[in-house]
Amino acid sequence: SQPQAVPPYASENQTCRDQEKEYYEPQHRICCSRCPPGTYVSAKCSRIRDTVCATCAENSYNEHWNYLTICQLCRPCDPVMGLEEIAPCTSKRKTQCRCQPGMFCAAWALECTHCELLSDCPPGTEAELKDEVGKGNNHCVPCKAGHFQNTSSPSARCQPHTRCENQGLVEAAPGTAQSDTTCKNPLEPLPPEMSGTMLM
């Protein structure tokens, strides 16, 4: 019959059959079970007994199959660093944080540790849309044709120029990247400086 694959078992080549859920214990030269997420090693394995696991206490966690003798302490999202919570800490997962609105991640070490204010985009531009909010600082791009943006803002979007005719008005001044179209009532006279350009 085939040798059993249930830990603890001898391993002369120092490798275990299930790398995710087992580990090689060098003192005893055996493969032992790791503890599942949400637990830790309360008693280490030996040749007679497999690893004994216990549930992480409140406000602590272990995310992966492990052979840690402690659970990691849950840490709150630090508002001083510009972070806010999106999901609470559980025994199997650390607190999930993200940058507060209007901020981007300025320091990354496996996870975001420090957020900073997004740069303003000047009039005539808008922040390029990113796949993930808060991942990087703003990259300002010009408003596309027929659109404008008239503030210095980290989040303002370019808006389409007003179409005067849709409102029963006529265009008094064309829109630019930084300003909207100016409309007027069709019965209103042209301003004096424009009278020379009227067709008779």
């Epitope: 019959s1 085939q2 040798p3 059993q4 249930v6 603890p8 078992y9 001898a10 002369e12 003192q27 005893h28 030269r29 008693a43 030996s46 040749r47 007679i48 007994r49």
Partner: antibody, heavy 122, light 111 residues
Framework: QVQLVESGGAVVQPGRSLRLSCAAS????????MHWVRQAPGKGLEWVAI????????YYADSVKGRFTISRDNSKNTLYLQMNSVRDEDTALYYC???????????????WGQGTTVTVSS | QSVLTQPPSVSAAPGQKVTISCSGS????????VSWYQHLPGTAPKLLIY???KRPSGIPDRFSGSKSGTSATLGITGLQTGDEADYYC????????????FGTGTKVTVL
Amino acid sequence: QVQLVESGGAVVQPGRSLRLSCAASGFTFSSYGMHWVRQAPGKGLEWVAIIWYDGSDEYYADSVKGRFTISRDNSKNTLYLQMNSVRDEDTALYYCVRGDSEDFYYYDFDVWGQGTTVTVSS
Amino acid sequence: QSVLTQPPSVSAAPGQKVTISCSGSSSNIGKNYVSWYQHLPGTAPKLLIYDNNKRPSGIPDRFSGSKSGTSATLGITGLQTGDEADYYCGTWDHSLSASYVFGTGTKVTVL
């Protein structure tokens, strides 16, 4: 030198109790698991029980489970075997044996005492 | 009754070689390391081989061990009269409840 000396062996009536002791010297007793192993007259070796280096866990052979209790006093460097409800088949030479170390490369059953004789007879 | 089976006896002339087999199952030899012990009359048993094939310091290289599947073997070469003793294999067993098991024992006689 490393030494294990058993004592407490005696003639005891079936159903009665007896306590064996094992005095350890020459090594850090509190760092080692310890075993009791026995050999009945004309028979082979039989493992009886193990206790962890810190006394946190114990295991027993099915033949003695519920009747025998292994214990230790690390302050006295002494291992014990409390034998209750003894039977005729418990008649044997009882050896105290050094087990696995808490913090060294695994090396089990490497030091044996000379044994103490238990005779169960009415 | 032991779950590790050994031949009751083996014999050979001085200088010859003997081998002792130890047969178990997947719950003991199949998944654990095997040790071998020498028990000379009137003395305490002595550890000869551990982890299938390793010798403690002081044990001559005339003694060797091996394991394959659910069986283990002890070899003694250059047999000497002082080798006349009972030999036991041993390993941890994880069938129902964990325990250490010894083999039935083999008497080695030097002719």
